[in-house]
């Protein structure tokens, strides 16, 4: 697992413990909470990041309301079960044996049940809509400049292949970033759109996951882009299975 050899740290994940005890004395970094070795040359999976976040006391956070068109992370933080590759296990359960099924970004996609609940497969989230509202500025940003800057950000900071940034929409003050990545499109080594979206979400909140880097300084032609509200919608390859009671609530 690559990491900065000089001081043995993980550039892409500060929620790790790194030590020069890897093969041949190389730097090896393990995610807090799970202890899984992580590849520091790319983003760490959202599941391992959530597990690391839950390994120490945290402040509760305010959540957005669920959308009727897509899944929104309305259940808040939980301590997830990750598979050996660091992905979310399809079925998640809490300490009181309440279980539910999640999608590939760890968002609940069924009603809650008991230990008998079956989640046959991990359903892929193939479309993520990041909805931002920026703080008032002297004038609207130039759409093509904004588009180019956000695409550059996802390519350079999050190492997401440009083909997965499907569109950037802008109607002042709302910015929408569409990420699309089908199972068939994702090749080995490609950053997952769910992981990129999570890193972006944490960056926007001033909680950068990168080691030793400054916080996110988003500028469009020198003008700061300051986000005051973020909503993230998740669309799965297979529609979620909620009871009518929830759907009509």
């Amino acid at each position: 697992h690559t990491a900065a050899q000089d001081n043995c740290t993980c550039p892409t994940n500060k929620m790790t413990v790194c030590s020069p005890d890897g093969p041949g004395g190389r730097c090896q970094c393990r995610a807090l909470g799970s202890g899984m070795a992580v590849d520091c040359s790319t983003l760490t999976s959202k599941c391992l990041l959530l597990k690391a976040r839950m390994s120490a006391p945290k402040n509760a956070r305010t959540l957005v309301r669920p959308s009727e068109h897509a899944l929104v992370d309305n259940d808040g933080l939980y301590d997830p079960d990750c598979d050996p590759e660091g992905r979310f296990k399809a079925r998640q359960c809490n300490q009181t044996s309440v279980c539910w099924c999640v999608n590939s970004v760890g968002v609940r996609r069924t009603d809650k049940g008991d230990l008998s609940l079956r989640c046959d497969e991990l359903v892929r989230t193939h479309h993520i809509l990041i909805d931002l509202r920026h703080r008032p500025t002297a004038g609207a940003f130039n759409h093509s400049d904004l588009d180019a800057e956000l695409r550059r950000l996802f390519r350079e900071r999050y190492r997401l292949h440009p083909k997965f940034v499907a569109a950037v929409h802008y109607e002042q003050p709302t910015i929408q970033i569409e990420l699309r990545q089908n199972t068939s499109q994702k090749a080995a080594g490609d950053v997952d759109i769910g992981d990129a979206a999570y890193y972006f979400e944490r960056d926007i909140k001033g909680e950068s996951l990168f080691q030793g880097r400054g916080g996110l300084d988003l500028r469009v032609r020198g003008e700061p882009l300051q986000v005051e509200r973020t909503l993230i919608y998740y669309l799965d390859e297979i529609p979620p299975k909620f009871s009518m009671k929830r759907l009509t609530a």
Partner: antibody, heavy 117, light 107 residues
């Protein structure tokens, strides 16, 4: 030569605490995890937790989480494992082990802790 | 937590025979497995790391294989000093866990 030297045998009463030490030498103390593993008489090996001496980050097996504390003293290259609220089933040999390349490469000689009223 | 199941619990063999010890993980752990030998009154001794990589100073008759969930420790020709208890251990994730052990005894 890498060496891990542990403190001597202890006899404790139920409810008491025990603190076992593990002094490391022959390598850069702060660079490698120290793990604690115990073995009850006639039983297998059980991992209790570990500590990274460089920053004192600890990780405990859930089974012992409320009773175990691991600390380190970099000035003496020593790691300590304290187990509280002892019960008879804690009678075991306690080993410290230095962790490298995904394996427990070096082991202390073991410390027998006997819990008896 | 990842559960490691070793089989058989006891292996009765004669010196010179081949010993095959098995370790099965409850989930895919790649090659994050190590093997240890323990004799009575002694601390365990590392034999194999990363499922198949030998440790310097360990006789060549000890070899490891496998990946994912099924792992094997093979002793090609048992020497008298090889009769002991053998443990597998995973370091894929915390908590690190050990198998229950296989005792190799003289037949």
């Amino acid at each position: 030569e890498v060496q891990l030297v542990q403190s001597g045998a202890e006899v404790k009463k139920p409810g008491a605490s025990v603190k076992v030490s593990c002094k490391a030498s022959g390598y850069t103390f702060t660079s490698y995890w120290i793990n604690w593993v115990r073995q009850a008489p006639g039983q297998g090996l059980e991992w209790m937790g570990n500590i990274y001496p460089s920053n004192s980050y600890t990780n405990y097996n859930q089974k012992f989480k409320d009773r175990v504390t691991m600390t380190r003293d970099t000035s003496t290259s020593t790691v300590y494992m304290e187990l509280s609220s002892l019960r008879s089933e804690d009678t075991a040999v306690y080993y410290c082990s230095s962790y490298r390349s995904d394996a427990f490469a070096y082991w202390g000689q073991g410390t027998l802790v006997t819990v008896s009223s | 937590e990842i559960v490691l199941t070793q089989s058989p619990a006891t292996l009765s063999l004669s010196p010179g025979e081949r010993a095959t010890l098995s370790c099965r993980a409850s989930q895919n752990i790649g090659t994050s497995i190590s093997w240890y030998q323990q004799k009575p009154g002694q601390a365990p001794r590392l034999l194999i790391e990363f499922a198949s990589e030998s440790i310097s100073g360990i006789p060549a008759r000890f070899s490891g294989s496998g990946s994912g969930t099924d792992f094997t420790l093979t002793i090609s020709s048992l020497e008298p000093e090889d009769f002991a208890v053998y443990y597998c251990q995973q370091s894929n994730s915390w908590p690190f866990t050990f198998g229950g052990g296989t005792k190799v005894e003289i037949k």
